[in-house]
Interface confidence: low
């Protein structure tokens, strides 16, 4: 469900998740009585959306949504909720929520949930935070302004004409002089690329013509020739002054290693916080809501809302019911147990250092750790056959009657020359194991150690039938290793 | 595969190695989609128009170490996509034995569109450009990039058709490469892996801002199913 993080009018219908006052103080939970006993609570005003500690306007205050604060000296304060961009747009219209559905040239927009006449990958269900409703103009991908696919088969997409808002824009996000996440809020003055090329000024069109201009991206601070990330790239970048190299990323020092952001990021839990740990989880841990944030190898978990060091889709917006708060271990996707993305750039994710609660009151069951080995049975354990067993390579070495098999390389008690390891090097004729080198319809056999019986069949059970292997379902769990 | 890692053996059981019948040299990948059928890239079949020139290796992990689970099957028929798209079907001379190490990938619904930024996986024995793991099956995780974005001048500048899809890390360093052509790009959907792409082409391998390009399998499902029925 798309949660609108903006207000219309006085914001009495606001149901977003802002939970700080305009001065940055955390809100008190509406259901709490400390530090302030509330007049408005979920029990007294059940229809006002008084969930958690989110800013709300249950009393139709003219100044908009507010909350009780966690500061004992300040009973309540107002929140900075931007106006919904319904009639106009701020910045590049990333948060535009209006209903314009015609392009600049007057073409009707194609509905986002339609694949006709233009097939595309902007699937509303996969991008709940982008509000891809009906056929309204939107900007889900860092364009200069909202656009849509058109209903004209000859024109795949086109920009829409959305007027700019004239009221003051929403307060900017905290900005940094160092690299945080993808660097969309980087406002430093680095102006050379990773290979040492000087950046082209954003306002100029030589040597490279482009549309990443200060006019098109008014809120992205495209000043001078400083490296920026106006369009959702993976890191700050710039066009270069080398006509042979259109653009390149920049080397920006990480905020992790430098302590000089303009403002600290309030979404990251403070390091000194020592949360209470719920020591175990039930079943596969989808209901686990503890505060453990350490993996099985001792790594710290990455915040679910963060995209650094690992970009991912398991965000609180995409999985609103999965409890993806802070950087706590969770299981949003039905895995074996709670896990998290790690803060180690070389290890994308790991299971967490948690035990499964005993559901029968017995001993605690350890969650299996992530193994780099295949989880399917090893060859030595696979003592079953497919079809007629021509490919059987198990270790059964007695006949169905219980007689031990003669070794394939041996010539006692039976001399033979047709089925030997030399004549059939690919038939797996090792030791005295049952085999089917000739594709006998009755299955694997061996020469027997009974001098009166040259050969006999072995009793090898059939493996789960081929039909039990469904397409697209490996029997060995893939590693799913991240990129590099 | 450049970047990524060595796969768990047999964890991508639909991956096949397409080889010349006489030298046994691996030159392309492919995907088992039914016991008798392999999907690959049409450009992998430029060496010869005769099916007897090729053989298919299934159930392998090491490129040149013959495991006990390996099946080797000759090719009975080559079927190229009629509109010159880079996709082709190989009919095997006999059905592969479906085991825990040889399992087909699922085909997508016709015309299904993979959502932008969906995480998918490529596999192959292709060029690693010194990134470790040569000779063993490698895998890498890549996000799909919407054609609208991929065709920006900064990336592939209008080269990508609607019958193709892009996937890659824009920062570079991870990609399919020579020898991976014809192999699978699979995406996990609900409870299984679905073949969404056939490795086709790229501007170099693993270069920043140059994602790999894959044939969009969903656009050819009707053709694939028709050919499998008729043959």
């Amino acid at each position: 469900v798309y949660l609108s993080e903006c207000k219309t009018g006085i914001g009495n219908g606001y149901r977003g998740t802002m939970s700080r006052t305009k001065s940055g103080v955390a809100c008190q939970k509406w259901g709490a009585t400390f530090p302030h006993v509330p007049n408005y609570s979920p029990s007294t005003h059940p229809n006002e959306g008084l969930e958690e500690n989110y800013c709300r306007n249950p009393d139709n205050d003219e100044q908009g949504p507010w909350c009780y604060t966690t500061d004992p000296d300040k009973r309540y304060d107002y929140c900075n909720i931007p106006e919904c961009e319904e009639e106009c747009m701020y910045c590049s219209g990333e948060k535009y929520e209006g209903k314009i559905s015609k392009t600049m040239s007057g073409l009707d927009c194609q509905a986002w949930d339609s694949q006709s006449p233009h097939a595309h990958g902007y699937i509303p269900a996969k991008f709940p935070s982008k509000n891809l409703k009906m056929n309204y103009c939107r900007n889900p991908d860092g364009e200069p302004r909202p656009w849509c696919f058109t209903t004209d088969p000859t024109k795949r997409w086109e920009y829409c004409d959305i007027p700019r808002c004239t009221t003051p824009p929403p307060p900017p996000s905290p900005t940094y002089q160092c690299l945080k996440g993808r660097g969309e809020n980087y406002r430093g003055t680095v102006s050379v690329t990773v290979s040492g090329k000087t950046c082209q000024r954003w306002s100029e069109q030589t040597p490279h013509r482009h549309n990443r201009t200060p006019e098109n991206f008014p809120c992205k601070n495209l000043e001078e020739n400083y490296c920026r990330n106006p369009d959702g790239e993976t890191a700050p970048w710039c066009y270069t002054t080398d006509s042979q190299l259109r653009w390149e990323y920049c080397e920006i020092p990480s905020c992790e290693s430098s302590a000089s952001p303009d403002q600290s990021d309030s979404s990251v839990p403070p390091e000194e916080q020592t949360p209470v740990v719920q020591e175990c989880y039930q079943s596969d841990g989808q209901s686990y809501r503890g505060t453990s944030s350490t993996t099985i190898t001792g790594k710290k978990c990455q915040s679910w809302a963060a995209m650094f060091p690992h970009r991912h889709s398991k965000t609180p917006e995409n999985f609103p019911d999965a409890g993806l708060e802070m950087n706590y271990c969770r299981n949003p996707d039905g895995d074996k147990g709670p896990w998290c993305y790690t803060t180690d750039p070389s290890v994308r994710w790991e299971y967490c250092n948690l035990k499964r609660c005993s559901e029968t009151g017995g001993s605690v069951v350890e969650l299996p750790t992530v193994s780099q080995e295949p989880s399917g049975p090893s060859d030595s354990e696979t003592d079953c056959m497919y079809g007629n067993g021509k490919d059987y390579r198990g270790k059964t070495a007695v006949t169905a009657a219980g007689t031990p098999c003669q070794g394939w390389a041996a010539q006692e008690p039976h001399r033979h020359s047709i089925f030997t390891p030399q004549t059939n090097p690919r038939a797996g004729l090792e030791k005295n194991y049952c085999r089917n080198p000739d594709g006998d319809v009755n299955g694997p056999w061996c020469y027997t150690t009974n001098p009166r019986k040259l050969y006999d069949y072995c009793d090898i059970p059939l493996c789960a039938s081929a039909s039990s292997f469904e397409c697209g379902k490996p029997q060995v769990e893939p590693k799913k290793c991240p990129g590099r | 595969v450049v970047g990524g890692c060595v796969a768990n053996p047999h964890s991508w059981p639909w991956q096949i190695s397409l080889r010349t019948r006489f030298t046994g040299q691996h030159f392309c990948g492919g995907t088992l989609i039914a016991p008798e059928w392999v999907l690959t890239a049409a450009h992998c079949l430029e060496k010869s128009s005769r099916p007897e020139f090729y053989k298919v290796i299934l159930g392998a992990h090491e490129e040149y170490i013959r495991g006990l689970d390996v099946q080797e099957i000759s090719v009975a028929k080559l079927i190229l996509e009629p509109n010159n798209r880079d996709i082709a079907l190989l009919k095997l001379s006999r059905p592969a034995t479906i085991t825990d190490k040889v399992i087909p990938a699922c085909l997508p619904s016709p015309n299904y569109m993979v959502a932008d930024r969906t995480i998918c996986y490529i596999t192959g024995w292709g060029e690693t450009q010194g990134t470790f793991g040569a000779g063993r099956l490698k895998e890498a995780q890549l996000p799909v990039i919407e054609n609208k974005v991929c065709n920006r001048v900064e990336y592939l500048n209008n080269r990508v058709k609607s019958t193709e899809l892009c996937a890659g890390q824009l920062a570079g360093g991870v990609d399919s490469c020579q020898g991976d052509s014809g192999g699978p790009l699979v995406c996990f959907e609900k409870d299984k892996y679905i073949l969404q792409g056939v490795t086709s082409w790229g501007l170099g391998c693993a270069r920043p801002n140059k994602p790999g390009v894959y044939v969009r399998v969903s656009r050819f499902v009707d053709w694939i199913e028709r050919e499998m029925r008729n043959n």
Epitope: T154, Q205, R209 | K148, N151, N158, V160, S162
Partner: nanobody
Framework: QVQLVETGGGLVQAGGSLRLSCAAS????????MDWYRQAPGKERELVAA???????NYADSVKGRFTISRDNAKDTVYLQMNSLKPEDAAFYYC??????????????????WGQGTQVTVSS
């Protein structure tokens, strides 16, 4: 690619007026600058007037105060209003535009296109 078609040329008396139009067509993503050039027989092609997508204009000294360039972004069209025409204004007038065009998909492939030209004759 992108095609430009100029219209509005013709024969006019000195002191008279003409309005030239240039319409761009094709899978246009955006147009940056649209310019009018002219070329008289035996002379170099010269820039007469230019206009950016934001509406900033530029004129050759010889036409300042007499010619006005304007554009309709929604129609991808540029106009040149020519007043107080002089015999030395007679020439072939060409439209030039640059920007980005689109083919199968969104694409910022750059274009720089010229029209075929329209003839302006000024009699004295």
């Amino acid at each position: 690619q992108v095609q430009l078609v100029e219209t509005g040329g013709g024969l006019v008396q000195a002191g008279g007026s003409l309005r030239l139009s240039c319409a761009a067509s094709g899978n246009i993503f955006s147009i940056n600058a649209m310019d009018w050039y002219r070329q008289a027989p035996g002379k170099e092609r010269e820039l007469v007037a230019a206009i950016t997508s934001g509406g900033t204009t530029n004129y050759a000294d010889s036409v300042k105060g007499r010619f006005t360039i304007s554009r309709d972004n929604a129609k991808d069209t540029v106009y040149l209003q020519m007043n107080s025409l002089k015999p030395e204004d007679a020439a072939f007038y060409y439209c030039n535009a640059d920007g980005y065009y689109s083919d199968y998909d969104k694409n910022l492939a750059e274009f720089n296109s010229w029209g075929q030209g329209t003839q302006v004759t000024v009699s004295s």
